[in-house]
Amino acid sequence: MAVTACQGLGFVVSLIGIAGIIAATCMDQWSTQDLYNNPVTAVFNYQGLWRSCVRESSGFTECRGYFTLLGLPAMLQAVRALMIVGIVLGAIGLLVSIFALKCIRIGSMEDSAKANMTLTSGIMFIVSGLCAIAGVSVFANMLVTNFWMSTANMYTGMGGMVQTVQTRYTFGAALFVGWVAGGLTLIGGVMMCIACRGLAPEETNYKAVSYHASGHSVAYKPGGFKASTGFGSNTKNKKIYDGGARTEDEVQSYPSKHDYV
């Protein structure tokens, strides 16, 4: 029962994590204008992986997509790639794990097959989570570097009367969503891998026992059950109980509207 719960929980945690990775990838607030010197601004800039936006005091927001591919920084392209790989791996992992769930019966699928599928999806979730964490961390590092560079530039060349204030960017909400989501996917993957160990039928090594019958000397050695490594296993060992754990997979998150002056 604990194995089923672990597997189910791992699935749900990974599902939430992957939903978060998708949300973070689509979000526009990867970097937001630093408001340290001016906490309330008439023009507020923020940027995502796919477009940059400007919100005015008037309440209007204008977003413009990055319509160039070659003109974008290599780091941004790398972050995009990492996030997409994370989403793809996570989606495949979810698909595999659905069929691997112990509480779902599909034909005469063996526990050994389910164990392998659980392990596969677990590994996929771990890699997916790592991709998301790596992507977000690369972007964060890029922001930190640019922040200090623009801070240094702010205090140079101000001898004249006219000031040119350079817009500095800091961490946006998407980074935190990405980190948390990546972490959840990673945790979910680890849970799936743990569940896999419990799902795999144990190799029972019975010692050879000699039965001495009168007149004959017969040695009887029962064969041990061995878990198959392939998906299409033909071994017929079945668990006696059927796990009945149910998963709460209809978790909806509603975006909140933030209005700024």
Epitope: A42, V43, N45, V54, E56, S57, G59, E62
Partner: antibody, heavy 118, light 113 residues
Amino acid sequence: EVQLQQSGAEVKKPGASVKVSCKASGYSFTGYTMNWVKQAPGQGLEWIGLINPYNGGTSYAQKFQGRVTMTRDTSISTAYMELSRLRSDDTAVYYCARMNYGNAMDYWGQGTSVTVSS
Amino acid sequence: DIVMTQSPDSLAVSLGERATINCKSSQSLLNSGNQKNYLTWYQQKPGQPPKLLIYWASTRESGVPDRFSGSGSGTDFTLTISSLQAEDVAVYYCQNDYSYPLTFGAGTKLELK
């Protein structure tokens, strides 16, 4: 047709308060930020502050901070500006103005004359 | 605060002639996010509220005659009336719409010569 109708002229004594209203019509009141601008006799324009009618968020010019309060009543599409501890240099015409693209004020009220005199 | 400096204080131009009003800001009004200059021009006639002419430094408000045009970027801006008409006699103000507090220039009084 977009219209901003302001309340009538006021005569106040120093130290008193005045509350000017601005009734909006012809557009979605909560969809546009409302600004207040002061114009002293024979002088230029001076920004007092703004209010976001959607959430009531405000931003005031430092000069008026602590003396000005901007509110709104979305049920009657009206914005208010209250100026307290009035002084003689508060004698001016006060305008409400709707903010549009580029933070530009595209529609203005007719103005409310406030005279502070003892 | 961003200081807006208008020049000249007053300007006398003949009918049909070109009128040019300058506005200089103490800080750049160019927003890097959308590459737009947050500068607005208003016209005010005696006893009337101001009227919006140009926003984003060069975008003409709908209904404004095309003889009015705005130009400039960063800190230096210009309002040009290509052929002055009698109804253009007014006071013209530039305004910083980029940073709080939103500040206006002192105004330029345009008169007929």
